[in-house]
């Protein structure tokens, strides 16, 4: 149902990385505008992005209130310039989004190697603990704060002079690996949430190599 000059939104899609969460939909509006509502399964509807001509709405502020909740959004279509107009059923045309549980579904952003330090034949590689928009006690939480031990990192490393890679894993943000003295190594990391069945892994971090600025070398 709905007025003759509005069409319902479709292809409602959640785009979420490290809890930054945007709802996208189609079509590009022609003589119509949209309003989005979001709710938890048991909560009240909250309106966002009022009468917008955009086809996306940033819902981060709502979902970060409880990232373990399951959310549902809906997109209402109104005739441009006549937003009080309703459909034949007495309410505006709308379409529901798929359900979205941020903790289980947000994509893991590409990690960054913060630093590496060589001490003799050991290298300590540290992964940057990225800040999220999830807040607790007025402080932004890091990815590790949110996921705890549910988040692990996989390190790929290899001698600059060869192609054979090795791997290690950690449930902190640090790796301590053995290396051959006098060899330069390159590193890349990947974030993983083993308990998930989808969106389990991030893309690989940019490669960082010894002998470049980011690291520190100490001969002991």
């Amino acid at each position: 149902s709905g007025t003759t000059n509005t069409v319902a939104a479709y292809n409602l899609t959640w785009k979420s990385t490290n809890f930054k969460t945007i709802l996208e939909w189609e079509p590009k509006p022609v003589n119509q505008v949209y309003t989005v509502q979001i709710s938890t399964k048991s909560g009240d509807w909250k309106s966002k992005c009022f009468y917008t001509t955009d086809t996306e709405c940033d819902l981060t502020d709502e979902i970060v209130k409880d990232v373990k909740q399951t959310y549902l959004a809906r997109v209402f279509s109104y005739p441009a310039g006549n937003v009080e107009s309703t459909g034949s059923a007495g309410e505006p045309l709308y379409e529901n989004s798929p359900e979205f549980t941020p903790y289980l579904e947000t994509n893991l952003g590409q990690p960054t190697i913060q630093s590496f330090e060589q001490v003799g034949t050991k290298v300590n590689v540290t992964v940057e603990d990225e800040r999220t928009l999830v807040r607790r006690n007025n402080t932004f939480l890091s990815l590790r704060d949110v996921f705890g031990k549910d988040l692990i990192y996989t390190l790929y490393y290899w001698k600059s002079s060869s192609s054979g890679k090795k791997t290690a894993k950690t449930n902190t943000n640090e790796f301590l690996i053995d290396v051959d003295k006098g060899e330069n190594y390159c590193f890349s990391v990947q974030a993983v949430i083993p308990s998930r069945t989808v969106n389990r892994k991030s893309t690989d971090s940019p490669v960082e190599c010894m002998g470049q600025e980011k690291g520190e070398f100490r001969e002991i």
């Epitope: 996989t154 090795k166 290690a168 894993k169 389990r200 690989d204």
Partner: antibody
Framework: QVQLVQSGGGVVQPGRLLRLSCKAS????????MHWVRQAPGKGLEWIGL????????IYDPKFQGRFSISADTSKNTAFLQMDSLRPEDTAVYYC??????????WGQGTPVTVSS | DIQMTQSPSSLSASVGDRVTITCKAS??????LNWYQQKPWKAPKTLIY???SLADGVPSRFSGSGSGTDYTFTISSLQPEDIATYYC?????????FGQGTKLEIT
């Protein structure tokens, strides 16, 4: 449900090559690491290597590096183990396994490879 | 590379007995240790992961303990269906390495 179905084993002459397949169903291999493990007759388990099918990263036990090659075709949801210059001591049952990053949670049924002239 | 030394290589026990198998790593593996059960002509099955966690669907008579380099696998009350070979596996860093296996028999 999750399944790994292996194929490609058999009897092969020394020096030849063989490619084993591990066809996954019930999940997308891009979301997991895929491993190959072998077991010679009457012996223990031996880890060969792994692949991250999403980016093609491969890691091998150094003793298999060069002669064995792991690959994946995400469009076919299948992982492969190619073994070159096969030797009699490569005779074993070869298993593929899915790694959820905690443990190998699903295994293929195993495929026997016999290297003999 | 990390070496895993598993003992004993075989053991015989009676139904109801408490059975213990150990694995010693050549360096700290930070609890990245799993225990697998393998029955003849079958693929291995995970019993314990991250040294102490019970895998889904595994009976509670199986348990694991340990940290650093020393790990223990225990069957609190041996059942006839537990006849199998048991392996530890370290997966903290590559190459992943299995223990040599422990063949468990019932007397």
């Amino acid at each position: 449900q999750v399944q790994l179905v292996q194929s490609g084993g058999g009897v092969v002459q020394p020096g030849r090559l063989l490619r084993l397949s591990c066809k996954a169903s019930g999940f997308n291999i891009k979301d997991y690491y895929m491993h190959w493990v072998r077991q010679a007759p009457g012996k223990g388990l031996e880890w060969i290597g792994l692949i991250d099918p999403e980016n093609g990263n491969t890691i091998y036990d150094p003793k298999f590096q060069g002669r064995f090659s792991i690959s994946a075709d995400t469009s076919k949801n299948t992982a492969f183990l190619q073994m070159d210059s096969l030797r009699p001591e490569d005779t074993a049952v070869y298993y593929c396994a899915r790694d959820n990053s905690y443990y190998f949670d699903y295994w293929g049924q195993g495929t026997p490879v016999t290297v003999s002239s | 590379d990390i070496q895993m030394t598993q003992s004993p290589s075989s053991l015989s026990a009676s139904v109801g007995d408490r059975v213990t198998i150990t694995c010693k790593a050549s360096q700290d593996i930070r609890k990245y240790l799993n225990w697998y059960q393998q029955k003849p002509w079958k693929a291995p099955k995970t019993l314990i992961y991250y040294a102490t966690s019970l895998a889904d669907g595994v009976p509670s008579r199986f348990s694991g303990s340990g940290s650093g380099t020393d790990y223990t696998f225990t069957i609190s009350s041996l059942q006839p269906e537990d006849i199998a070979t048991y392996y530890c596996l370290q997966h903290g860093e590559s190459p992943y390495t299995f223990g040599q296996g422990t063949k468990l028999e019932i007397t």
